[in-house]
Interface confidence: low
Amino acid sequence: TVPPMVNVTRSNASEGNITVTCRASSFYPRNIILTWRQDNVSLSNDTQQWGDVLPDGNGTYQTWVATRICRGEEQNFTCYMEHSGNHSTHPVPSNGS
């Protein structure tokens, strides 16, 4: 088992909104749960967009999930990752990071 590296980034979307993207990379096996949570509850599937789980050329895999949120509400959102029985939670970085 190779645990994923998880990275959360943010980018400007429309006025007052930002897109937050959670990327998991370099993991094996390919089965993974990656989802955005608000106030400890997973967002519905129709408010999130997932990338395919793709091989990254090193015998491991990568994927991502993104969602659009209101600027200023970042602290209520976290990216949840579960892989091979391990799980972790990743906050949205502040504007300057």
Epitope: I33, N40, V41, S42, L43, Q75, H87, T89, P91
Partner: antibody, heavy 122, light 112 residues
Amino acid sequence: QGQMQQSGAELVKPGASVKLSCKTSGFTFSDNYISWLKQKPGQSLEWIAWIYAGTGGTSYNQKFTAKAQLTVDTSSSTAYMQFSSLTTEDSAIYYCARHDYYGTSGAWFAYWGQGTLVTVSA
Amino acid sequence: DVLMTQTPLSLPVSLGDQASLSCRSSQNIVHINGNTYLEWYLQKPGQSPKLLIYKVSNRFSGVPDRFSGSGSGTDFTLKISRVEAEDLGVYYCFQGSHVPWTFGGGTKVEIK
């Protein structure tokens, strides 16, 4: 599953403040949501608020927004709740509890501290 | 706020009996993500509450299979198939779908 050890009983005067602690061990503190709950003797439970240890983000029951303030100290894996302007109505047992969540399922108060009795009396 | 109403207030049982506890919410408690965050807790005298059931029907780890939860929308039930002495105490239902999260008033299960 880990442990949650709460601070000892408090006897405080009306108008004063009290800061309760919930020291955790046995799990990754920063991955977790910690809630605080209130239970008056012989009564049901009330949810006060939660704090996400990873960022300090909070969500409050509006009833307690002027009364409670939640903080965390990640270096000691400890959650705190400061309760202010105490009245006799605030006399209760206060619990901290840890959320448990996997993927899209969730259990809100999976693991509990032993509770702290706060008595407000002149 | 979502009002959670539990009946009966007290439930006298004989050991080995089946017990059925009811919980009704004042509004539908399906979360926007489609899940129903309805939980059941047992509190014994002088102890912290313990989680039994989450998301209506899922037994928490270590909870015996004599406990089962069911229901949907606004009406929920906890059944204990054969009551044992360690099951006595106050049972609370709880909804975590709508903030503020709220508990029912409790049902006390005691010896008949």
